[in-house]
């Protein structure tokens, strides 16, 4: 905590400027103004301040706005948003996408901390779901958002936010994830015609039921082994050899080198020896 | 990893020169931001001399006309040239870096770990 004492003559900040780096703690705290701060709080980005100046800085903000800092503060923070604790964080009212971005951009490079969890959280709930345009910011900063949240979040992302979802972003999803986005992902893509349909939805796959799978085996898909092995083992193992050997095409193939590997290992300890046989892989049930 | 050392600490007479130099690895001082900070006994850090091509050179009051901060690229040091010293400026001397970002403002700060100078009879 920094001692209070009274600013020196002549060194009451008129605003704030570079000159502010030449001042100890005490004189930050004696001769700034908590609501000149506030109101210049975009310059504070351009100044090499230290960590130890804009702990004084910030703990001025924190006497100013006890119940937390308004959005104007909030979107110039720059670099003293990462000196805010998630405690200092869930008492802001974050609306604006704009003001989200400039706070990400500030942690941009580095992993999600929990002030951007919890900055994030914040301004999800102040939106009541995960809109398109949120969707789109969140994975353009962190590609693994989507599958950091848990199945009762994601129930609370419309069918319309999907189209903002690359297949990057499934990538660390669980099947209990993709269970809750591909219902939204199939409601989304909809009016899409067979080969396009299928170039969106492939990623969602992982939470396709096994009347769906054999829907898609009727429409030459040619699915590629890596996204049929991330299919739900229980909507694979109903599939017949036929399907199967029309849902894949020519990456058919491929299964001899996953025979040993679920879900193949087990839809083919399913699959009667003559029918495995038609495939000439070599499989043995 | 980033380090920081400063040199060139030690004791000189009133009215004499020293010369601080810190050296720096892991992150050059170019395109960056080099200072020169002090703390004298029981009183809180303070900024010296600093510079930056964002910034240019700047210098506290009380040492103004007296100390020049230079920077040599190739060596990827940032120099303090200290004359007519005096007791008041009797401190730990530390060298500070920080990075500045591409996308603008600045990014981790670091410190050496400090050279005593003491200016004394």
């Known amino acids: 905590e920094v001692e209070k004492t009274a600013c020196p003559s002549g060194k009451k900040a008129p605003e704030i400027d570079e000159s502010l780096i030449f001042y100890k703690k005490w004189e930050l705290e004696a001769c700034v103004d908590a609501a000149l701060l506030a109101t210049q709080m975009d310059r504070v980005n351009a100044i090499p301040f230290t960590y130890e100046q804009l702990d004084v800085l910030k703990h001025k903000l924190d006497e100013l706005y006890p119940q937390g800092y308004p959005e104007s503060v909030i979107q110039h923070l720059g670099y003293l948003f990462l000196k805010m604790s998630p405690e200092d964080i869930r008492k802001w009212n974050v609306t604006s996408l704009e003001t989200l971005k400039a706070l990400l951009e500030v942690n941009k490079g580095h992993e999600m901390s929990p002030q951007v969890a919890t900055l994030i959280d914040r301004f999800v709930k102040g939106r009541g779901q995960l809109d398109k345009d949120t969707l789109d910011t969140l994975t353009a900063f962190y590609p693994g958002y989507l599958c950091s949240l848990s199945p009762e979040e994601l129930s609370s992302v419309p069918p319309s936010s999907i189209w903002a979802v690359r297949p990057q972003d499934l990538d660390t999803c669980d099947p209990r994830q993709l269970d809750v986005l591909y219902p939204k992902a199939r409601l989304a893509f909809q009016n899409m015609n067979g080969s396009e349909y299928f170039v969106k939805i492939q990623s969602f796959l992982g939470g396709a039921p096994t009347e769906d799978l054999k829907a898609l085996s009727q429409q030459n898909v040619s699915m590629d082994l890596a996204t049929f092995m991330k299919l739900r083992t229980d909507a694979v193992l109903p599939l017949t050899v036929a399907e199967v050997q029309k849902l894949l095409g020519p990456h058919v193939e491929g299964l001899k080198a996953e025979e040993r590997h679920r879900p193949v290992r087990d839809w083919i300890l399913r699959q009667r020896q003559d029918d495995l046989d038609t495939l000439g892989l070599g499989l043995q049930g | 990893e980033v380090q920081v050392v400063e040199s060139g600490g030690g004791l000189v007479q009133p009215g004499g020169s020293l010369r601080l130099s810190c050296a720096a690895s892991?992150?050059?001082?170019?395109?960056?931001?080099g200072g020169w900070f002090r703390q004298a006994p029981g009183e809180q850090r303070e900024l010296v001399a600093s510079?930056?091509?964002?910034?240019?050179?700047k210098y506290a009051d009380p040492v103004k006309g007296r100390f020049t901060i230079s920077t040599d690229t190739a060596k990827n040091t940032v120099d303090l040239q200290m004359n007519s010293l005096g007791p008041e400026d009797t401190a730990v001397y530390y060298c500070?870096?920080?990075?500045?970002?591409?996308?603008?403002?600045?990014?981790?700060?670091?410190w050496g770990q400090g050279t005593q100078v003491t200016v004394s009879s």
């Open positions: 500070y870096a920080r990075v500045r970002l591409s996308r603008g403002g600045w990014g981790s700060e670091y």
């Open positions: 510079m930056s091509s964002a910034l240019g050179t």
């Open positions: 892991g992150i050059t001082f170019s395109g960056n931001y």
